[in-house]
Interface confidence: medium
């Protein structure tokens, strides 16, 4: 899933079927002047970045689990 790093939308496409086990961290970018849509950018275990679909119930579960995991550490 392509990720760009300029001051605009970073996600050109999103990955389907991504698994919690391979996600190290997740960054949720709210809409703003740079981009009109919410973007979810996951950092994978191998350091790669991948865009997830914020509308996907599975992605919402993943975000919830990762945020909960972070708050219990």
């Amino acid at each position: 899933a392509s990720v760009v790093t300029e001051l605009r939308c970073q996600c050109l496409q999103t990955l389907q079927g991504i698994h919690l086990k391979n996600i190290q961290s997740v960054n949720v970018r709210s809409p703003g002047p740079h981009c009109a849509q919410t973007e979810v950018i996951a950092t994978l275990k191998n350091g790669k970045k991948a865009c997830l679909n914020p509308a996907s119930p599975m992605v919402q579960k993943i975000i919830e689990k990762i945020l909960n995991k972070g708050s219990t550490n």
Partner: antibody
Framework: QVQLQQSGAELVRPGSSVKISCKAS????????MNWVKQRPGQGLEWIGQ????????NYNGKFKGKGTLTADKSSSTAYMQLNSLTSEDSAVYFC????????????WGQGTSVTVSS | DIQMTQSPSSLSASLGGKVTITCKAS??????IAWFQHKPGKGPRLVIH???ILQPGIPSRFSGVGSGRDYSFSIRNLEPEDIATYYC?????????FGGGTKLEIK
């Protein structure tokens, strides 16, 4: 292209150990989980466990804990599985399989290594 | 551990026909199911992942659907090279678990 080349067939005695290998090529070995799967003659597939060569992290099927030990050598891009205290129940074909970096589907498999335990 | 109940264990179909295999998980697996084709003497081949996504190079005759606990895999316009054993695999929760397999034969 991605290839997983497994070591040759083994005939071993009950009670002994065996170490089988899976040499990876065509991709960044450290960045992908390597899985091991067992198939007994005439039976289905059973997941044994997996190793992430980048940091040595492992996950095992509880059924195989203590039976198999997974290791990986980044310098040679080779994953290993050692099976201990072998019995006839361990006679099987063992496959290594690479797991993709994001969705964990096992997309490339080795050809299998046959292990026969017999006295 | 999640149990995967695959059926039928074997089936026979005609060339050009259609077959459907089902897998039922013991709990919701969130669409994390893959389907493999396995021929004797070779390593299994990934056909479908995440319920319905076809692996590159796999013909569109293969398809998968499902959600929750219930999933199915179909092959239409059966060809001789489709003769194999097919397995489902859940990868929602460790340990990953396979279905018992379905041996496909051509009439």
């Amino acid at each position: 292209q991605v290839q997983l080349q497994q070591s040759g067939a083994e005939l071993v005695r009950p009670g002994s150990s065996v170490k089988i290998s899976c040499k990876a090529s065509g991709y960044a070995f450290s960045d992908y989980w390597m899985n091991w799967v067992k198939q007994r003659p005439g039976q289905g597939l059973e997941w044994i466990g997996q190793i992430y060569p980048g940091d040595g992290d492992t996950n095992y099927n509880g059924k195989f804990k203590g039976k198999g030990t997974l290791t990986a050598d980044k310098s040679s891009s080779t994953a290993y599985m050692q099976l201990n205290s072998l019995t006839s129940e361990d006679s099987a074909v063992y496959f290594c399989a690479r797991e993709r970096d994001y969705d964990v589907a096992m997309d490339y498999w080795g050809q299998g290594t046959s292990v026969t335990v017999s006295s | 551990d999640i149990q995967m109940t695959q059926s039928p264990s074997s089936l026979s179909a005609s060339l050009g026909g259609k077959v459907t295999i089902t897998c039922k998980a013991s709990q919701d697996i969130n669409k994390y199911i893959a389907w493999f084709q396995h021929k004797p003497g070779k390593g299994p081949r990934l056909v479908i992942h995440y319920t319905s996504i076809l692996q590159p190079g796999i013909p569109s005759r293969f398809s998968g659907v499902g959600s929750g606990r219930d999933y199915s895999f179909s092959i239409r316009n059966l060809e001789p090279e489709d003769i194999a054993t097919y397995y489902c695999l859940q990868y929602d929760n460790l340990p990953w678990t396979f279905g018992g397999g379905t041996k496909l034969e051509i009439k």
